[in-house]
Amino acid sequence: MVPEEEPQDREKGVWWFQLKVWSVAVVSILLLCVCFTVSSVASHNFMYSKTVKRLSKLQEYQQYYPSLTCVMEGKDMEDWSCCPTPWTSFQSSCYFISTVMQSWTKSQNNCSVMGADLVVINTKEEQDFITQNLKINSAYFLGLSDPKGWRHWQWVDQTPYNKNVTFWHSGEPNSPDERCAIINFRSEEWGWNDVHCHVPQKSICKMKKIYI
């Protein structure tokens, strides 16, 4: 026969059980707080170091570009892609339209000083983007030339010249003495034309976006 529990013993058991439950709860909460604090500090430190890195990168680039325009990119919107102000951006590149009239070689040197090259056009979409910002009564040098006049066209950045991805106007190129390419508006569309390299024209510079 099992002896009956005394009321005070029952109360003692309940109290002891509650104490254990509360202890576990308090310890768990404390652990959660500690974890949260640690992760917050770690996350803060991570974010802080990322910001510091970004700022130092920005300062580094500001030696060359007084002002950068940046947008957030990437799946977590954590990366910044930047172009010098007032360059425009398209896909992974930045573009600058120079209205200074210069020879082809001088135009390329001018782009080079800014960390860029005369524009290399790789797709119709890229050309369509560029031409939105051009004046239809002007011509602009491209980074495309044929220095020997042998009709061996070459891009300034050594991108292979692909005849299938060219946008020459009808009948162009048409003269071995015209060894540099421009983009201009003719017959209701934008296209390329070969011209004398020494004749001053406007130009378009292109550079890779700056990622920070």
Epitope: S175, R179, H196
Partner: antibody, heavy 121, light 111 residues
Amino acid sequence: EVQLVESGGGLVKPGGSLRLSCAASGFTFSSYGMSWVRQAPGKGLEWVSTISSGDSYTYYPDSVKGRFTISRDNAKNSLYLQMNSLRAEDTAVYYCARQIYYDYAYYFDFWGQGTTVTVSS
Amino acid sequence: DIVLTQSPASLAVSPGQRATITCRASESVSFRTSHLMHWYQQKPGQPPKLLIYGASNLESGVPARFSGSGSETDFTLTINPVEAEDTANYFCQQSIEDPPTFGGGTKVEIK
């Protein structure tokens, strides 16, 4: 043999006009850019104007812009320089020269003997 | 405009000696491996005659005693050895950018 023969020079009063001609032979005239270059007495060479092979491009220095006009007639193998509103400082020997393209620029590989223009009252 | 400055303005050289003429451009007339400076000889009463194109290429028919060198802004025409018939004016010229320009000339006299 490449030959360039200038003609049309002479004595003219300030404000007057002259038309210089350059007859080319010995090469395919229509395939070459051409220029006029002048040399004042005892002075250096000064480029005066350029015309591309296909006549699509002409260029002048500020000193003659609006007064001189370069032109060509490929059928006649001839180059011309129409000079209006002549000034004393235009006095010089005028040479026509053939352009040869070299990489991104050009040089003058053949020159005519020159024709003398004197502007004086 | 690109200004070309030649030196010296005149030069007297003994036959068999070396004559060196320099031409300095107000800005670069080179692009990568292309050096776009040219040299001419002009004898009294005659038109200019091409000697050197592209800084160092000898024009066909020009004697090998003429040579050219240089890049960017500094170019040199060398005559070695000088001969009596080399008495003439020598001009440098660029046309990397319009307008094409000439140096002021160097008068070479044979002693």
